[in-house]
């Protein structure tokens, strides 16, 4: 058992049929030493009488906010929450297993930037009686401030017959130099809690690994004289850590119609202009990479043709 | 340690395409280490990620550009020299912070030469012949330190009596690409950025 | 099965003009791009030009420009390149090509042999 | 126009060993550039296209890499039918133009 906050506590359990569970020891909070009971949630029944109450907690039926009284008045609460191990792995039943770049990745993240901020996002289909804490580091060992705010319902999908929310949080990195030459993972640890359960995930990345730029900005589009050609420019999303000789893009264009299988004209460049060929009801889309580090690449920004 | 005195190619900044070639071909080379070594804790994950320039050189400090020395993150971690004009470009009067940076960086490609030599005289000897390094990669670590053009002390290729652990080294060998990669990176960002200059 | 089957060898005078057919099968003939590459004998590949055969719309090489017309037919999809003006050093293997991308080729024709000859 | 420079023009190489073949553009033309077997008698075949993305049906033996101006075919082990012409294409601007070829024989 480990305290996750002031009087909220979480019981570790291996999680099998007839597993005996762990012995827990509660101590009220008070100076008096008798006259005290034990309840637990809303129910009246004494579990029993002392300062210390030992119980057995072996399933969901045993967790919650165990309080201890004298007289009729409220003397402390503790909130004992489980955590699921089964065969020998941590349960992971509140977030749902967002499948990309590879199994089991529940959080994900992105930075716009090298600026030492990011946003990290999961999924999950409950509804109600959830909450969740982020913390973060540079390093575990020795770790670097990295400070979060908190998480917040960020988007609502239907899948299916499921919903599906989304939550996120953004994160600073206290002293981040976006020049620097990163050794050392930021690490993000996210406690959930879904009524009594409790659960914890994390992720480990280099934010040069996390980096999906901004689309391009300003998309303008010249024809050129007596040619099918048209000559289309852009400039770097004001998101982008500069100077932009230094934190350089390089730029897919593409022109496109409605459907991802009819044809197309395609080139890259680092320059932010490109000439195309433009084709009536197709449209123009430009995207950016780091040009140095090949991470993401960023939505497509895009116009008309016409 | 004397500064070498850098005089850097007359016409079109030089060093820029050197860089380049540098970055596709140290990613090229990590590329192929780890479908090779795929057996072998070989990805940004499993890897430690060791600086083998660490306290030796400080090319992200020296070459820092002029926008970010205001960012006092960037400045923080030891005394710090950083270009604040000129470029690598015809001009003989190559500024001194300017020189620093440039020489910081040849200094980071001969350390990674040498080990990297070190590395491929073991990996000849493996009997599995697993991998070696692209002879291309050494090559193009060649061209930019002469492009460069820095005189500079000649550092001993390490010899060692002992038999060589093939596992240890292409692990090291891993490790070396993975940092290797980081600095041309930066490598390249500070060419452009002269180059823009 | 995408395939381009092109028309058979011709000999042309020099000053004469040349057609050769490029017949599409297999997919949708206006969802493609369809360019022209000649192959002159012992040498590389130059580039000719392309079609839009949904739209008609071509692009031309300038070395080519005014002496080269690049025509589709949908309906029996079909595409055309015309070579006028012809001197001997045109003779070469004429290759019908295309692509739903436009700056690269995927799929060849056979190939036509052009000989100019007087 | 842009000019692709392919080097050597002709590569001896051993069945077995890897082969490298090297294209030079006269500009700088990003990863706008495509690879094509050849063989006698016979239409070019796409291996690679914008530098390094392979293309489905072509074995992993191939592969691309480069950017800017200069880029490299790499055949990792030559097999028996690899013995042909490779041909670089640029596609960076119109008109779209050709290496001279480099000819892979047996050595």
């Known amino acids: 058992i480990w305290e996750l906050k002031k009087d909220v506590y979480v019981v570790e359990l291996d999680w099998y049929p007839d597993a005996p569970g762990e012995m827990v020891v509660l101590t009220c909070d008070t100076p008096e030493e008798d006259g005290i009971t034990w309840t637990l949630d809303q129910s009246s029944e004494v579990l029993g009488s002392g300062k210390t109450l030992t119980i057995q907690v072996k399933e969901f039926g045993d967790a919650g906010q165990y309080t201890c009284h004298k007289g009729g008045e409220v003397l402390s609460h503790s909130l004992l929450l489980l955590h699921k191990k089964e065969d020998g792995i941590w349960s992971t039943d509140i977030l749902k297993d967002q499948k990309e770049p590879k199994n089991k990745t529940f959080l994900r993240c992105e930075a716009k930037n090298y600026s030492g901020r990011f946003t990290c996002w999961w999924l999950t289909t409950i509804s109600t009686d959830l909450t969740f804490s982020v913390k973060s580091s540079r390093g575990s060992s020795d770790p670097q401030g990295v400070t979060c705010g908190a998480a917040t319902l960020s988007a609502e999908r239907v899948r299916g017959d499921n919903k599906e929310y989304e939550y996120s949080v953004e994160c600073q990195e206290d002293s981040a130099c976006p020049a620097a030459e990163e050794s050392l993972p930021i690490e993000v640890m996210v406690d959930a809690v879904h009524k009594l359960k409790y659960e914890n995930y994390t992720s480990s990345f280099f934010i040069r690994d996390i980096i999906k730029p901004d689309p391009p900005k300003n998309l303008q589009l010249k024809p050129l004289k007596n040619s099918r050609q048209v000559e289309v420019s852009w400039e770097y999303p004001d998101t982008w850590s500069t100077p932009h000789s230094y934190f350089s893009l390089t730029f897919c264009v593409q022109v496109q119609g409605k459907s991802k299988r009819e044809k197309k004209d395609r080139v890259f460049t680092d320059k932010t202009s490109a000439t195309v060929i433009c084709r009536k009801n197709a449209s123009i889309s430009v995207r950016a990479q780091d040009r140095y580090y090949s991470s993401s690449w960023s939505e497509w920004a895009s116009v008309p043709c016409s | 340690r004397n500064l070498p005195v850098a005089t850097p190619d007359p016409g079109m900044f030089p060093c820029l395409h050197h860089s380049q070639n540098l970055l596709r071909a140290v990613s090229n080379m990590l590329q192929k280490a780890r479908q090779t070594l795929e057996f072998y804790p070989c990805t940004s994950e499993e890897i430690d990620h060791e600086d083998i320039t660490k306290d030796k050189t400080s090319t992200v400090e020296a070459c820092l550009p002029l926008e970010l020395t205001k960012n006092e993150s960037c400045l923080n971690s030891r005394e710090t020299s950083f270009i604040t004009n000129g470029s690598c470009l015809a001009s003989r009067k190559t500024s001194f912070m300017m020189a620093l940076c440039l020489s910081s960086i040849y200094e980071d490609l001969k350390m990674y030469q040498v080990e990297f030599k070190t590395m491929n005289a073991k990996l000849l000897m493996d009997p599995k012949r697993q991998i070696f390094l692209d002879q291309n990669m050494l090559a193009v670590i060649d061209e930019l330190m002469q492009a460069l053009n820095f005189n500079s002390e000649t550092v001993p290729q390490k010899s060692s009596l002992e038999e060589p652990d093939f596992y240890k080294t292409k692990i090291k060998l891993c490790i070396l690409l993975h940092a290797f990669r980081i600095r041309a990176v930066t490598i390249d960002r500070v060419m452009s950025y002269l180059n823009a200059s | 099965q995408v395939q381009l089957v092109q028309s058979g060898a011709e000999v042309k005078k020099p000053g004469s003009s040349v057609k050769v057919s490029c017949k599409a099968s297999g997919g949708t003939f206006s969802d493609y791009y369809l360019h022209w590459v000649r192959q002159a004998p012992g040498q590389g590949l130059e580039w000719m030009g392309w079609?839009?055969?949904?739209?008609?719309?071509?692009e031309y090489a300038p070395k080519f420009q005014g002496r080269v017309t690049i025509t589709a037919d949908e309906s029996t999809s079909t595409a055309y390149m015309e070579l006028s003006s012809l001197r001997s050093e045109d003779t070469a293997v004429y290759y019908c090509?295309?692509?739903?991308?436009?700056?690269?080729?995927?799929?060849w024709g056979q190939g036509t042999l052009v000989t100019v000859s007087s | 126009d842009i000019v692709m420079t392919q080097s050597p023009l002709s590569l001896p190489v051993t069945p077995g060993e890897p082969a490298s073949i090297s294209c030079r553009a006269s500009q700088s033309i990003s990863i706008n550039l495509h690879w094509y077997q050849q063989k006698p008698g016979q239409a070019p075949r796409l291996l690679i296209a914008?530098?390094?993305q392979s293309i489905s049906g072509v074995p992993s033996r191939f592969s691309g890499s480069g950017s800017g101006t200069d880029f490299t075919l790499t055949i990792s082990s030559l097999q028996p039918e690899d013995f042909a012409t490779y041909l670089c294409q640029q596609s960076n601007s119109f008109p779209l133009t050709f290496g001279q070829g480099t000819k892979v024989e047996i050595k």
């Open positions: 914008f530098a390094s």
């Open positions: 090509a295309r692509n739903k991308e436009l700056r690269y080729i995927d799929v």
């Open positions: 079609i839009d055969p949904e739209n008609g719309d071509t």
